[in-house]
């Protein structure tokens, strides 16, 4: 995880020694670099990246996705709603990142780094959001049964699931990064 530096962030109207905006920005870019490396292995290993049968696998997944109502797009932007969505989405992605562990041969360490860096990012963002409404955490029991279900899929579906998780996580982080730059 790349080291961060503190900055002079102030949550209006009170000055707070919050996490730095630079640290959040760098952390997201670091995770995106990791995802690129994992996608490279996935695409080299199978033809999933060109597959048109994604809908079959997507039926089993409920991957977090940015929608207009989440307030993270330029149109209808709402910083507080958006920040809550980013944190909630990252928390929901954690089970899928756990699934990615052991799905890679040459990039096993990279998969672990993406998972651990995401945990750190969530901590940074929770500090930034500490004046906002409580953020709901996914139910561990539900996550455990989802993980079991995903791991029980056939090889083709597991490959497709891996591809879809990486693609969705990349899109989610890119949208998050754009929105967070305004905050």
């Amino acid at each position: 995880v790349p080291p961060g530096e503190d900055s002079k962030d102030v949550a209006a109207p009170h000055r707070q020694p919050l996490t730095s905006s630079e640290r959040i920005d760098k952390q997201i870019r670091y995770i995106l670099d990791g995802i690129s490396a994992l996608r490279k292995e996935t695409c080299n290993k199978s033809n999933m990246c060109e597959s048109s049968k994604e809908a079959l696998a997507e039926n089993n997944l409920n991957l977090p996705k940015m929608a207009e109502k989440d307030g993270c797009f330029q149109s209808g932007f709402n910083e507080e709603t958006c920040l809550v969505k980013i944190i909630t989405g990252l928390l929901e992605f954690e089970v899928y990142l756990e699934y990615l562990q052991n799905r890679f041969e040459s990039s096993e360490e990279q998969a672990r780094a993406v998972q651990m860096s995401t945990k750190v990012l969530i901590q940074f963002l929770q500090k930034k959001a500490k004046n906002l409404d409580a953020i709901t955490t996914p139910d561990p029991t539900t996550n455990a049964s989802l993980l079991t279900k995903l791991q029980a899929q056939n090889q083709w579906l597991q490959d497709m699931t891996t591809h879809l998780i990486l693609r969705s996580f990349k899109e989610f982080l890119q949208s998050s990064l754009r929105a967070l730059r305004q905050m």
Epitope: Q74, F77, E79, R181, Q182
Partner: antibody, heavy 119, light 106 residues
Framework: EVQLVESGGGLVQPGGSLRLSCAAS????????MSWVRQAPGKGLEWVAK????????YYSDTVTGRFTFSLDTSKSTAYLQMNSLRAEDTAVYYC????????????WGQGTLVTVSS | DIQLTQSPSSLSASVGDRVTITCSAS?????MYWYQQKPGKAPKLLIY???NLASGVPSRFSGSGSGTDFTLTISSLQPEDFATYYC?????????FGQGTKVEIK
Amino acid sequence: EVQLVESGGGLVQPGGSLRLSCAASGFTFSPFAMSWVRQAPGKGLEWVAKISPGGSWTYYSDTVTGRFTFSLDTSKSTAYLQMNSLRAEDTAVYYCARQLWGSYALDIWGQGTLVTVSS
Amino acid sequence: DIQLTQSPSSLSASVGDRVTITCSASISVSYMYWYQQKPGKAPKLLIYDMSNLASGVPSRFSGSGSGTDFTLTISSLQPEDFATYYCMQWSGYPYTFGQGTKVEIK
């Protein structure tokens, strides 16, 4: 036309206060963070402060922290810089600038308003 | 705070010349921007996020670099390009600017 218009500058004595306004027009104000940047006569540019689009987060340079306050009135598409305990070294043209969506770039700037702190 | 040093501080050039301005940071920066300012006017964004051309800016302007060393290049100087150019960085707050480079007519 997309534009920012600053007002409120003028001559003020050291220790005095002034409130600058920055009125936005030609674009939807709500998704953009705003910054103030100043330029002392014949000198370079110095960033002063930033406010997030809804006003939840503000950032200040060390030189103005505790003296200046950045606020918004989104219903009026206007940003304000309340400047207290003014010093001679605060004398400058003050520009407000919009932050480009998805970037930290300051892409639209006002024409500036001159603040002179002198006795 | 991160210090930005531009070089040269001023230069004389002719229309059609290729002009290069450099910006050196005291430590590695996350994002670099370039601005043009004419006397009595507000700065105008030319390049954002290292190398992206801002909307409405002619393609003769280009930006490059990473880490601590960055360059603004004007491939063929035009009469309207005589101005002062500033680099600006963001790596957390505060934003900081270079001291400026004045491009004058030879």
